[in-house]
Interface confidence: low
């Protein structure tokens, strides 16, 4: 009876920095007792380790067992459906899960105003699961870049943008007053990782922030 159940149609990783989640799509017509078995293979150690015998969700947090992702050749995962004594064939991730698959994010963006400039500070992510020595800046130690998207409210202007190579940036507001909203997307110039836009941070600039000089 080993292969009576259909296999999960697809299995994939969605990952941010030290937040590595395996996802899969459910089998058609699954019953209330259907659950999913998850196994993990680390490249270089060619054997599958069972991680979960019976997950009833459609995702599983593999961060704790892939903490060495950033220092390894990567992983593959596989999932199969289980229902009582019946189980499906395995469905394996179709790409290797490596550091290249991690979507880059920022922790937060802090804005302040100084003499008509908006000064921005990008806080890098500090996930609780990360080992103490594995900081974002130690793993991505070179070529960190950020796209800064700026929107002025009110105003009928699009997002416009600039690129910076530091966690600190400044925006000259050209004497404008109003609310300025900023988003940041990280990248690493030497890598192909996707980046995710941060949530928008806004700051209001009024006349009081401009110093009059003679």
């Amino acid at each position: 009876h080993g292969t009576e159940l259909p296999s999960p149609p697809s299995v994939w990783f969605e990952a941010e920095f030290f937040h590595h989640i395996l996802h899969w799509t459910p089998i058609p017509n699954q019953s209330e007792s259907t659950c999913y078995e998850v196994a993990l293979l680390r490249y270089g150690i060619e054997s599958w380790n069972s991680i979960s015998n019976c997950s009833q969700t459609l995702s599983y947090d593999l961060t704790a067992v892939t903490l060495d992702l950033y220092h390894s050749n990567g992983y593959r995962a596989r999932v199969r459906a289980v229902d009582g004594s019946r189980h499906s064939n395995w469905t394996v991730t179709n790409t290797r899960f490596s550091v290249d698959e991690v979507t880059l994010t920022v922790g937060s963006v802090n804005l302040e105003i100084h003499n008509g400039f908006i000064l921005g500070k990008i806080q890098l992510p500090r996930p609780k699961m990360a080992p103490a020595n594995d900081t974002y800046e130690s793993i991505f130690s070179h070529f960190r870049e950020y796209e800064i998207a700026i929107r002025k409210v009110p105003g009928n202007f699009t997002f416009t943008h600039k690129k910076v190579k530091h966690e600190n940036f400044s925006l000259l507001t050209s004497g404008e007053v109003g609310e300025f909203c900023v988003q940041v997307k990280p990248s690493v110039a030497s890598r192909s990782n996707k980046g995710m836009w941060s949530k928008e941070e806004c700051i209001s600039l009024t006349r009081q922030y401009f110093t009059v000089t003679n």
């Epitope: 998207a149 700026i150 699009t158």
Partner: antibody
Framework: QVQLVQSGAEVKKPGASVKVSCKVS????????MHWVRQAPGKGLEWMGG????????IYAQKFQGRVSMTEDTSTDTAYMELSSLRSEDTAVYYC?????????????WGQGTTVTVSS | DIQMTQSPSSLSASVGDRVTITCRAS??????LAWYQQKPEKAPKSLIY???SLQSGVPSRFSGSGSGTDFTLTISSLQPEDFATYYC?????????FGGGTKVEIK
């Protein structure tokens, strides 16, 4: 809301120069990044140049380098585009257009266009 | 320079049709792409910015998608006033560059 109003049509002889103006209302010119785009009859849009606030200078498309000058009169909130050594292939509609202030921009607001005809 | 390639260069469609226009950049431009509509003897009008954000006042039947190198403008149900020429433009880096245009004509 920003509005851009351009100067009227011009007819010029080959070798001459033309200066097109673009008057801003609703915002001051210093709050904007002004660009110039042209369109030859029956052809597509071609960016000529514009102000890059990150560097604080005007960037020109290589094709027009040395022949075009883009200036601003902040006292009247008017931008100007001057094209010299005109030839017949410069016959086109010339548009000023602007977006926000920071870095390269999409062009959210356009002038109505100025037709320049170069003919002997 | 970043080349922008639009396709098709022209298309014929009827009122109510779903119309899709594509724009491909010669290198990655993130989301920094705008779409414009131009009618004969008129200045271009901005429809979409940042690849998928609708300009205020533009009908919701217009939508944009894509990032990196491949972008799409979709008109979900073509209206009589939508017959025009459409241009994409990248604003990731200078020089700013436009696609060659797509003329949408009445079938």
């Amino acid at each position: 809301q920003v509005q851009l109003v351009q100067s009227g049509a011009e007819v010029k002889k080959p070798g001459a120069s033309v200066k097109v103006s673009c008057k801003v209302s609703g915002f001051t010119l210093t709050e904007l990044s002004m660009h110039w785009v042209r369109q030859a009859p029956g052809k597509g849009l071609e960016w000529m140049g514009g102000f890059d606030p990150d560097d604080g200078e005007t960037i020109y498309a290589q094709k027009f380098q040395g022949r075009v000058s883009m200036t601003e009169d902040t006292s009247t909130d008017t931008a100007y585009m001057e094209l010299s050594s005109l030839r017949s292939e410069d016959t086109a509609v010339y548009y000023c257009a602007t977006g926000g202030y920071y870095g390269p921009v999409g062009m959210d607001v356009w002038g109505q266009g100025t037709t320049v005809t170069v003919s002997s | 320079d970043i080349q922008m390639t639009q396709s098709p260069s022209s298309l014929s469609a009827s009122v109510g049709d779903r119309v899709t226009i594509t724009c491909r950049a010669s290198q990655g431009i993130s989301i920094w792409l705008a779409w414009y509509q131009q009618k004969p003897e008129k200045a271009p009008k901005s429809l979409i910015y940042a690849a998928s954000s609708l300009q205020s006042g533009v009908p919701s039947r217009f939508s944009g998608s894509g990032s990196g190198t491949d972008f799409t403008l979709t008109i979900s149900s073509l209206q009589p006033e939508d017959f025009a020429t459409y241009y994409c433009q990248q604003y990731n880096s200078y020089p700013l560059t436009f696609g060659g245009g797509t003329k949408v004509e009445i079938k």
